[in-house]
């Protein structure tokens, strides 16, 4: 997946207490056991800094070299730094390790802006505040990279969450969490809660404050308030989910359906903001523009460019709209929406202007690439990937960002015909492409 | 064309409150194209950015001067004013009005800026 | 907050002499940065905007160019009535709001 734009986030101290969850209703279908209830050790095992990703402790090798993994759903390998780097405080050391496989193959993942390249290696992998187990996994032993390490990101590696189908060098390289599934009895599924701060944090804030829970193998109630609702996963390779309807303040965009998807609608919780097509970028921009327009903001703003300061604590949200995207259902001719407020599409910037000033990114872009769900989605919601049942869960998130007029919401169903055509078919002959990095 | 014409007294007392007019001539103040701002140049000194204003009164200010400073907007005289209250002899300056063009980015058009002077 | 530092402070060469002002800005600010020119007892008059777009009807000897931390305004060939002051400000943080110290440029 892709930096700079492609990189979240922000984290941090979430809208609500930790401690202090909402009651979450119970009119929800039953579960096979096992794959609900608490599962305290992974609750708040995410840390992360704004618009520098999220990220989980794991160790590799034997005796264990702890390292910070950035959690990356819009991406498939397994891959950590393995050698000296400018941005890297820690790196893992194959010839310490006495669990170390060379695959003897090379690796080379080339993104719209930056790369990395390494050398394929299996070892063996836990996450100290995860399930109780350990895998042998495929590890992408990062030798060279450019544009890839943040400095002052804290993270060391990527852990891709996707299907094997957009893995590299190819798809017989199996991912990560495939190898867990296979090698122990974690249910098929992981969950996440990333818990935007609402403002920025310094990086001792950052590693104090909780960023958010990976809960694998299960969902957690106290994560999240009212219902889970399910959207399919159209295919196995990204988290490929389809977007029916689009409103802005309640206000439909009135485009085909085709446009919102055009050429897939992602979700990806290493891309910072929500990315949408051209043409859905242009009419949602004027529409956002149109409801806000008792004040102004510059072209660049619009870009994402620009930053827009006011006064401490006078932030204007209530000249923003909400923003509301409907995802087909788990039903025939059914769909729910999932609605975010300007508390996640407006992205704290630090150290811009004074301590006296909040200052904020404009945190909705174009793609070319398709519709990206990335962080100002997710920070709004607890998404369950239920890779088991081929669908994903959204609630409203017990941390995100809100005021006391409007918060997210995850509501439905509503009946919406046809959603089928929503989906774009990418043609054969394009897909090679495409997958060699994500304007 | 458009013109931009300050107009206030030249000398206030210490404490008191400064007020200054800016008076747009040759275009509607209320074209959404526009902010509108104040900046100041203390004598020998360099450009301090007040603060700027919509048609609508959506008003931005500099923080250092926060507290202290009003900017309005009067659409029906096609004029905006200034008001800087407690002034002491550090807000003695030159004070220009300018609009905010370039799409709300850069001062493209200035007053000729009026001298206040604070001093009992 | 973001800091512009202007250099030098005096600049002092004779007409049709190439002029190099530099802006340097403490932290990024793309390439939102715009020039002005002061002359006594006149309002600042804008030069350049974007960093490197001249404004309406100001002459093709003045250019601007940098983006991130770094910026130029070059006079390629100082006119008689170029000998003023110069001040930077940047708009990446919105809205605009610091201004450089300024760089003037007199006759030697």
């Known amino acids: 997946t892709q930096h700079g734009i492609r990189l979240p986030l922000r984290s941090g101290l979430g809208g609500a207490p930790l401690g202090l969850r909402l009651p979450r209703e119970t009119d929800e279908e039953p579960e096979e056991p096992g794959r609900r209830g608490s599962f305290v050790e992974m609750v708040d095992n995410l840390r992360g800094k704004s618009g520098q990703g999220y990220y989980v402790e794991m160790t590799v090798g034997s005796p264990p070299q702890t390292l910070n993994i950035l959690v990356d759903t819009g991406s498939s390998n397994f891959a950590v730094g393995a050698a000296p780097h400018p941005f890297l405080h820690r790196y893992y050391q194959r010839q310490l390790s006495s669990t170390y496989r060379d695959l003897r193959k090379g690796v080379y993942v080339p993104y719209t802006q930056g790369k990395w390249e390494g050398e394929l290696g299996t070892d063996l992998v836990s996450i100290p505040h995860g399930p109780n187990v350990t895998v042998r996994a495929n590890i992408a032993a990062i030798t060279e990279s450019d544009k890839f390490f943040i400095n002052g990101s804290n993270w060391e590696g990527i852990l891709g969450l996707a299907y094997a189908e957009i893995a590299r060098p190819d798809d017989s390289l199996e991912p990560f969490f495939d190898s867990l599934v296979k090698q122990t009895h974690v249910p098929n599924l992981f969950s996440l809660q990333l818990c935007g701060a609402g403002f920025p944090l310094n990086q001792s804030e950052v590693l104090a404050s909780v960023g958010g829970s990976m809960i694998i193998g299960g969902i957690d109630h106290s994560l999240y308030t009212g219902s889970l609702w399910y959207t399919p996963i159209r295919r196995e390779w990204y988290y490929e989910v389809i977007i029916v309807r689009v409103e802005i303040n309640g206000q439909d965009l009135k485009m085909d359906c085709k446009e919102y998807n055009y050429d897939k609608s992602i979700v990806d919780s290493g891309t910072t903001n929500l990315r949408l097509p051209k043409k859905v970028f242009e009419a949602a921009v004027k529409s956002i523009k149109a409801a806000s327009s008792t004040e102004k903001f510059p072209d660049g703003f619009w870009l994402g460019e620009q930053l827009v300061c006011w006064q401490a604590g006078t932030t204007p949200w209530n000249i923003f709209p909400v923003i509301s995207l409907y995802l087909m259902g788990e039903v025939t001719n059914q769909s729910f929406r999932i609605t975010i407020l300007p508390q996640q599409y407006l992205r704290p910037v630090e150290d811009v202007a004074t301590s006296q000033d909040d200052c904020y990114k404009f945190a909705i872009s174009q793609s070319s690439t398709g519709t990206v769900m990335g962080a100002v989605i997710m920070e709004g919601f607890y998404v369950v990937f239920d890779r088991a049942r081929k669908r994903i869960g959204f609630a409203v998130s017990a941390c995100h960002v809100h005021d006391e007029f409007r918060t997210a919401a995850v509501e439905g169903p509503f009946v919406t015909l046809d959603m089928e055509d929503c989906g774009y078919n990418i043609p054969q002959t394009d897909e090679s492409t495409l997958m060699t990095g994500r304007a | 064309q458009l013109q931009l014409q300050e107009s206030g007294p030249g000398l206030v007392k210490p404490s008191e409150t400064l007020s200054l007019t800016c008076t747009v001539s040759?275009?509607?103040?209320?074209?959404?194209?526009?902010?509108w701002g104040w900046i100041r140049q203390p004598p020998g000194k360099g450009l301090e950015w007040i603060g700027n204003i919509y048609y609508s009164g959506s008003t931005y200010y500099n923080p250092s001067l926060r507290g202290r400073v009003t900017i309005s907007v009067d659409t029906s005289k096609n004029q905006f004013s200034l008001k800087l209250s407690s002034v002491t002899a550090a807000d003695t300056a030159v004070y220009y009005c300018?609009?905010?063009?370039?799409?709300?980015?850069?001062?493209?058009?200035w007053g000729r800026g009026t001298l206040v002077t604070v001093s009992s | 907050e973001i800091v512009l530092t202007q250099s030098p402070a005096t600049l002092s060469l004779s007409p049709g002499e190439r002029a190099t002002l530099s802006c340097r800005a403490s932290?990024?600010?793309?390439?939102?940065l715009a020039w002005f020119q002061q002359k006594p007892g006149q309002a600042p008059r804008l030069l350049i905007y974007?960093?490197?777009n001249r404004a309406t009807g100001i002459p093709a000897r003045f250019s601007g160019s940098g983006s991130g931390t770094d910026f130029t305004l070059t006079i390629s060939s100082l006119e008689p009535e170029d000998f003023a002051v110069y001040y930077c400000q940047q708009v990446y943080v919105w809205p605009p709001r610091t201004f450089g110290g300024g760089t003037k440029v007199e006759i030697k």
């Open positions: 040759g275009g509607p103040i209320s074209s959404s194209s526009y902010y």
């Open positions: 932290q990024s600010v793309s390439s939102y």
């Open positions: 974007d960093a490197s």
């Open positions: 300018a609009r905010l063009g370039h799409g709300y980015n850069y001062f493209d058009l």
